[in-house]
């Protein structure tokens, strides 16, 4: 089931998927002056079995200078809405990402790929947020969002990250910084679609994330 909307935006923050759930689609977009090859795929699809997931189809771009046709626009699969885009920079990923069952890792770039990637997320997808450079987390509650299905409709959970540019915030004295505990959240406020194993693995990944994995920014 595709998610109807884009993941929520957080002021002065970017989000990133660490891995993509099976069923996720990535549009085959080419940079200006290039187009998809004639018989090329419209999108890549994350598919797999119980032990291994990978991207089906390959995106291929060719120079459009050889054709004197009108400007070609990449069609979207019929009933799908456009997903959030991401600027392609370094597709560096944490090594443990591949071990997440039922998920694909970030697809490697293809030749003459567009500068932005358009993903079509599915229910159960999780994305992680981080404050942009020059801002810091005033409050770091759950800094992720999950696409979940409620009452037959999809919705992304609201991340509880507040990024501030103000460096002079006051902290009350004599208080140790507590550890936020994601496992303490009531069921009604988490997605029933994300298994404990998924959540723990992804939380551990999020906890060990280095800034470098956020180099592929979502606009």
């Amino acid at each position: 089931e595709l998610c109807d909307d884009d993941p929520p935006e957080i002021p002065h923050a970017t989000f990133k998927a660490m891995a993509y759930k099976e069923g996720t689609m990535l549009n085959c977009e080419c940079k200006r002056g290039f187009r998809r090859i004639k018989s090329g795929s419209l999108y890549m699809l994350c598919t797999g079995n119980s032990s291994h997931s990978s991207w089906d189809n390959q995106c291929q771009c060719t120079s459009s200078a050889t054709r004197n046709t009108t400007k070609q626009v990449t069609p979207q699969p019929e009933e799908q809405k456009e997903r959030k885009t991401t600027e392609m920079q370094s597709p560096m990923q944490p090594v443990d990402q591949a071990s997440l069952p039922g998920h694909c890792r970030e697809p490697p770039p293809w030749e003459n790929e567009a500068t932005e990637r358009i993903y079509h997320f599915v229910v159960g997808q999780m994305v992680y947020y981080q404050c942009v450079q020059g801002y810091r987390a005033l409050h770091r509650g759950p800094a992720e969002s999950v696409c979940k299905m409620t009452h037959g409709k999809t919705r992304w959970t609201q991340p509880q990250l507040i990024c501030t540019g103000e460096m002079e915030t006051s902290q009350f004295p004599g208080e140790e910084k507590p550890q936020a505990s994601p496992e303490g959240r009531p069921e009604s406020e988490t997605s029933c679609l994300v298994t404990t194993t998924d959540f723990q693995i992804q939380t551990e990944m999020a906890a060990t994330m280095e800034t470098s994995i956020f180099t592929t920014e979502y606009q």
């Epitope: 509650g141 902290q171 406020e189």
Partner: antibody, heavy 115, light 107 residues
Amino acid sequence: QVQLVQSGAEVKKPGASLKISCKGSGYTFTDYAMHWVRQAPGQGLEWIGVISTYSGDAIYAQKFQGRATMTVDTSTSTAYLELSSLRSEDTAVYYCARGVTFDYWGQGTTVTVSS
Amino acid sequence: DIQMTQSPSSLSASVGDRVTITCRASQDISNYLEWYQQKPGKAPKLLVYNAKTLAEGVPSRFSGSGSGTDFTLTISSLQPEDFGTYYCQHHYDTPYTFGQGTKLEIK
């Protein structure tokens, strides 16, 4: 279910200080920042500030800087707002509200400042 | 600070009417906008967040739209229980400011 329960009404004299509380239940307290908002009689809503229940960091609206102090006690899942040097213009209903989108609010604490 | 301006400041409408309240920000706030409903003597209640997402439990007759500086809250078919004052508020940056409110009365 999620609840924010605030302390009872207060009557104070000008120049005095005030401390009101907001106890959260039904969710993990440190997951959500806490905002304080006030509403003078017949007036609109005014944002006082926000505190991270996780770190204790706080940001105040300029108007309340130096006179308002927000704190939290994570052991009791309670947020506090202290307001010093009270004046009659501070007469208002004070609310706590949870999270980025203020999705749950306390019932309000009526504060009357009068000589 | 970002100023939020609501219009109208008050309006009277009949049950079944389509009602629209607008909110304008003094600068671009993307979609970082919430709408609240407040009834006399009660705390505000979240209706819409991130400009267009309906809060849980809010009837589908309420909808939000807009982005940048101009936003709209629409009640498609006014119900008697919809009376009260409606506020918009941004969460783009601190201080998070509210609109002055729109008082909605049922004719």
